[in-house]
Structures are given as structure tokens and as C-alpha cells.
């Protein structure tokens, strides 16, 4: 079944290459297990940036080598993507799946356009 | 309907606070003198950022203390805004007036959303 997912239209990455945004999903039921995936869309291509499953009791945990971190609170997930460069500017889509218990729901946001500007290098300190 | 003015929807300022975009106007006549004004829109308020009049023979020249520079070629004006800070993020509208000879035409673009990120300070070199 389709589920509504909301996310901001535009976010600016910091000069350190960090971008944060909230992904909010609307569900009538109380899901115990939720999977959040961040996808990057380029043309008709979608590539997975990161994904994590969390339970209502436990905190959102991405893989250690993931570019993402996050926290969850009710139907809201605060996502942070790190290590971004100017070439990573693009549309990042939040996909939410209610995994357990049934029924299974899935929803995708319209995407957050993340803009990244590479910083000027600092002058050599000599 | 006025005169059609085209400008990009989004531009990112560089980490040095410089943003450039092209403002293109469509006119049936051959204007000898064209005035270009950059306006910043905040809510229903419009404030003038900079303005310059140029002739077909001469180059576009902003005032010496202006935050803008530019070049012109036919019906295209390349605008550069300098000294931008994160707080200057906003919608910048290009207004073009065909000043001389008559008839007077005016057109305004839909605006370019300029995003500005303040750079991280470089570490002290000591």
C-alpha cells in the first residue's frame, strides 16, 4: 500500500559537506519495525545512498561505514548525510517501509534537492 | 504581457560568496540603451541590489561600489553578484528595461534562487 512521506524540497549542505533533513511518514498503524532508505536520483537512475532499520525501542543505526547518521522520534526521522562534495549535488529521496508487523506499507518522498559547494582550500600555513 | 525575461531557477554561490547567472530578454525592437536591475525579493518586498544601463556599443558598467559586475552580448546579460553571505540567500529577480529609443519596454524574470553557504574559517596558522 502507498504511504505518504514528506521531506523538504531543498537543503544546503554545510561548508563541511554535511546535510541534514527530516523525513516524516504518515501511518495509521503502530509499526514496530521501520526501514528508512535514502536514494539518490540522477535522471531515471536511482542509487542507494544508505539504509537502516529501526525499532520503536531502539535507535536508528546505519552501518559503521555509512555516509548517513540519524535519529528517530515517532513518525519522524532526522537524517544526516556526511562527506558530500559539489559533485554529489542532486535529488535525495527518502523511502520508508513499515516492515513489521503486517500490513507492509511503503512510501517515497518527492525528494530533497541537496546543494553542495566545495570549500576554497585554506592557504598553506608557511 | 510585457517583455519576456529568462533567468535560471537556481544558482549556487561559490564558497567565496560569488554567484553568476545569465539574464536573457526577448525584444522585437533594436534597443540602443538597456537598463538591467537586480532586485532581491523577500516576501512582498523588493529591494534593489544593483542596476546599470548599457548601450549596444559600450560595455555594461555598474557603479564602482556596486556588489555586481556584468557583461552583455546581444540580448544576454551575464550578471555576477559578489560579497554574498549565507544571510543573502534568496530570490534575485532580473528586471530589464529598454530605455531608448522609444518604445519603452519592461520585463521581469521569475527570479533566480541564490543559495549561499558561509565557509568554515581556516585554522589559525601558528
Amino acid at each position: 500500500k502507498g504511504m505518504h512521506v514528506a521531506q523538504p524540497a531543498v537543503v544546503l549542505a554545510s561548508s563541511r559537506g554535511v546535510a541534514s533533513f527530516v523525513c516524516e511518514y504518515g501511518s495509521s498503524g503502530n509499526a514496530a519495525e521501520v526501514r528508512v532508505t535514502v536514494l539518490r536520483q540522477a535522471g531515471s537512475q536511482m542509487t542507494e545512498v544508505c539504509a537502516a532499520t529501526y525499532t520503536v525501542e531502539d535507535e536508528l543505526a546505519f552501518l559503521d561505514d555509512s555516509t548517513c547518521t540519524g535519529t528517530s522520534s515517532g513518525n519522524k526521522v532526522n537524517l544526516t548525510i556526511q562527506g558530500l562534495r559539489a559533485m554529489d549535488t542532486g535529488l535525495y529521496i527518502c523511502k520508508v517501509e513499515l516492515m513489521y508487523p503486517p500490513p507492509y506499507y511503503v512510501g517515497m518522498g518527492n525528494g530533497t534537492q541537496i546543494y553542495v559547494i566545495d570549500p576554497e582550500p585554506c592557504p598553506d600555513s608557511d | 504581457k510585457g517583455m519576456h525575461v529568462a533567468q535560471p531557477a537556481v544558482v549556487l554561490a561559490s564558497s567565496r560568496g560569488v554567484a553568476s547567472f545569465v539574464c536573457e530578454y526577448g525584444s522585437s525592437g533594436n534597443a540602443a540603451e538597456v537598463r538591467v536591475t537586480v532586485l532581491r525579493q523577500a516576501g512582498s518586498q523588493m529591494t534593489e541590489v544593483c542596476a546599470a544601463t548599457y548601450t549596444v556599443e559600450d560595455e555594461l558598467a555598474f557603479l564602482d561600489d556596486s556588489t555586481c559586475t556584468g557583461t552583455s552580448s546581444g540580448n544576454k546579460v551575464n550578471l555576477t553578484i559578489q560579497g554574498l553571505r549565507a544571510m543573502d540567500t534568496g530570490l534575485y529577480i532580473c528586471k530589464v528595461e529598454l530605455m531608448y529609443p522609444p518604445p519603452y519596454y519592461v520585463g521581469m524574470g521569475n527570479g533566480t534562487q541564490i543559495y549561499v553557504i558561509d565557509p568554515e574559517p581556516c585554522p589559525d596558522s601558528d
Epitope: - | A32, P102, P103
Partner: antibody
């Protein structure tokens, strides 16, 4: 604050001459082509003519062609209207305005009467 | 020649909406400007390029143009709006700017 101040209006006999001046302040005068507009008593507005920003090109309404001359001095932020062979029908309030009519002066009255 | 025709006068009560038309005898492709002239004062631009309002002009003033007719609308007129209103455009025949004959707006009690 933008200001356009016209001077030189006077009572003059038919066939006489008059020179109007318009001094600009508060904006980059050399960026703006300028116009002269007149308004006869209890009548509407009528364009007299205009001049480009550099002063190299002018145009005039048919009613004044050959009699009136518009010039400018960008160093003095001033535009001029030289009026020769004046007629009774030239009696009017004369306004200077930027070519996009964004800014107007307060006007100076020219009366042509014997 | 393209003459800009305006009604000689219009009147409306305080707070009412009033429109002033400016008709050309040809479907002129050129932009129309509107000027307000308060008694004893010089004209002031209230609409340029058919529908643009200069900063400082109250939002109750708006302009539009369709075919050979340009319209100035004042939504909710105030006592201080009592003035003469002129439209202005360009005429190919005279190769210059032309003004409408002017409309006197009277605000009733």
C-alpha cells in the same frame, strides 16, 4: 532621495525664446535617457521629446520639431530644453522625466502671450 | 493614429472598487503605463509595463492589459486617491509616446 528640479519658466512674447533646465540628484543621471513632457492649463499630458543618456540622439513630437532642442550635460547632471519661435499654444507646465517615466520633476511654467 | 481613449471622469464611494479603462483604436502591442496626478502636483508613476507597481505604491492599485484595452483598478479607494489618472503608451504613427486624455476620479463621501 531622487529629485528633478526644473527652472527657467517665464512669461515670454510669441516668437521669443526660452531655455529650461532640469537638474537631477539622487540617482545616476548618466544612466538615464531623459524626456520633456508638457501640460497645457486644464489639459492632459503631451510628450515634447527625449534624449539618450549620452546626449548623442534626440527625438521630438511633430508639434515642436525644428523649434525646440533638447541637450544635456552629464557632468552637471542637467538636461536642457531650448525653445525658439514660441507660440501661444506652447503655454504649459513643462516637466522633465526619466525615459521610463519613473521619476518626474515638479515642473516649471512657460507662458507665451503678448 | 492610435489615440488613447479614457473616460473623462469616474466616481466611487470610499472603499469601493473602481476601474479606469484606456482603449487604443488599434490592438497596440506596446506596454502601457499609468500616472496619478494629484491636484497641483506633478505626475507619479503608479503602474509600469502594464501591470508592475513601483515600490511605495499601495497594493490597492493594479493594472492589466488585454488586446486593445488597458485597465487600472483601484481596490478599496481612499480619499487620497482623488486625482487625475493618465495612461500612456507608444504610437507607431507619431513614432513617440502618447498619453490618454486623463480621467478625473472623484471619491464620494
Amino acid at each position: 532621495e531622487v529629485q528633478l528640479v526644473e527652472t527657467g519658466g517665464d512669461l515670454v512674447k510669441p516668437g521669443g525664446s526660452l531655455r529650461l533646465s532640469c537638474v537631477a540628484s539622487g540617482f545616476t543621471f548618466s544612466d538615464y535617457p531623459m524626456n520633456w513632457v508638457r501640460q497645457a492649463p486644464e489639459k492632459g499630458l503631451q510628450l515634447v521629446g527625449g534624449i539618450n543618456s549620452g546626449g548623442s540622439a534626440t527625438y521630438y513630437t511633430d508639434a515642436v520639431k525644428g523649434r525646440f532642442t533638447i541637450s544635456r550635460d552629464n557632468a552637471k547632471n542637467t538636461v536642457y530644453l531650448q525653445m525658439n519661435s514660441l507660440r501661444a499654444e506652447d503655454t504649459a507646465m513643462y516637466y522633465c522625466a526619466t525615459s521610463n517615466f519613473q521619476y518626474w520633476g515638479q515642473g516649471t511654467l512657460v507662458t507665451v502671450s503678448s | 493614429q492610435a489615440v488613447l481613449n479614457q473616460p473623462a471622469s469616474v466616481s466611487a464611494a470610499l472603499g469601493q472598487r473602481v476601474t479606469i479603462s484606456c482603449n487604443t483604436n488599434i490592438g497596440s502591442p506596446y506596454d502601457v503605463q499609468w500616472y496619478q496626478q494629484l491636484p497641483g502636483k506633478s505626475p507619479k508613476t503608479i503602474i509600469y509595463g502594464n501591470s508592475n507597481r513601483p515600490s511605495g505604491v499601495p497594493v490597492r492599485f493594479s493594472g492589466s492589459k488585454s488586446g486593445s484595452t488597458a485597465t487600472l483598478t483601484i481596490a478599496g479607494i481612499q480619499a487620497e486617491d482623488e486625482a487625475d489618472y493618465y495612461c500612456q503608451s507608444y504610437d507607431d504613427n507619431v513614432d513617440g509616446y502618447v498619453f490618454g486624455s486623463g480621467t478625473q476620479l472623484t471619491v464620494l463621501g
